[in-house]
């Protein structure tokens, strides 16, 4: 297939990736699906530099990222290894808190108002960030 060499309209390029920042809120699963339909994924933070870039663009607003533990282990949506990768949790987080009374614990990660991460109820309607890598094979079939 062809390769994407520049970011789509309304996406922001940074370090060979493209980012799209929502201005509305969705539950984590709906945000995840939105990104997939854009041939992208919820943002995967792999470095302090990328953390600062995303933080700068989202401001002090709760925002979903592509990290969850809905099936046990913490997993990044693109398969990046959680155990050995970059982490930026708030102190005492993640805590899988049950005190919210909504049922279950907290299985989805988001940026908090200071940029550090928290786990929260996946149904909460937070903003989200999509990411796609430049130079990766396009999802479109090649022209015949």
């Amino acid at each position: 297939g062809s390769e994407r060499t520049c970011c789509p309209v309304n996406w922001v390029e940074h370090e060979r990736s493209c980012y799209w920042f929502s201005r509305s809120g969705k539950a984590w699963a709906d945000a995840d699906n939105y990104c997939r339909l854009e041939d992208a994924h919820l943002v995967v933070v792999t470095s302090w530099e990328e953390q600062k870039f995303v933080q700068h663009h989202i401001g002090p607003v709760n925002t979903w990222m592509g990290l969850h533990d809905q099936n046990g282990p913490w997993k990044w949506v693109d398969g990046t290894d959680y155990e050995t990768g970059f982490k930026n949790w708030r102190p005492e987080q993640p805590d899988d808190w049950y005190g919210h009374g909504l049922g279950g614990g907290e299985d989805c990660a988001h940026f908090t108002d200071d940029g550090r991460w928290n786990d929260d109820v996946c149904q909460r309607p937070y903003r989200w960030v999509c990411e796609t890598e430049l130079d990766k094979a396009s999802q479109e079939p090649p022209l015949l």
Epitope: D69, Q70, N71, G72, P73, W74, Y82, E83, K87, W89, P91, E92, Q93, P94, D95, D96, W97, Y98, G99, G103, G104, G105
Partner: antibody, heavy 112, light 107 residues
Amino acid sequence: EVQLLESGGGLVQPGGSLRLSCAASGFSFSSYAMTWVRQAPGKGLEWVSTISGRGGHTYYADSVRGRFAISRDSSKNTLYLQMNSLRAEDTAVYYCAKQDCWGQGTLVTVSS
Amino acid sequence: DIQMTQSPSSLSASVGDRVTITCRASQDISNYLAWFQQKPGKAPKSLIYAASSLQSGVPSKFRGSGSGTDFTLTISNLQPEDFASYYCQQYHSFPFTFGPGTKVDIK
């Protein structure tokens, strides 16, 4: 590979104390809530206690509240269960568990 | 507290059979339900999380379904290694509670 290894079980008299340990490896220990579950001989599974990843929240079954204390030491990747005022009905295999993985269990026998 | 019931308490089946185990919660637990398999003298093994999500490494012959109060675990093409006890557990709210178990043995 995720591994959980319990230790500290044994024979204790009613009213006595034991501390169980669970050594964890193969995962980022402080990122996960951890749980103790027990199984009396020939019986089903009973949830005992859960502690959040950083230890800020603890939860207990009514049957052990006030007698058992769950804790964790992230520097040692170890989960603990301090069991006081033990009763005959606490006799069971005690399992340390993460959502998707269980240890092999350690047997606690309370008998005079 | 949320009570969990399972049926049947035991069942006999043959190799190759398809068996279904039912789990019922005393109140709505959404999809906060897990299934575990336990063989004699061994620790439980996690099969299903979130009512229908297969744990990594678990064969697709195990299928979980349901939401709210009624859940099922279906095991297709039963093999000798599948003869064991099966437990459901709710993790909607504390105290977490297990069903009493279903023992699947060879007919």
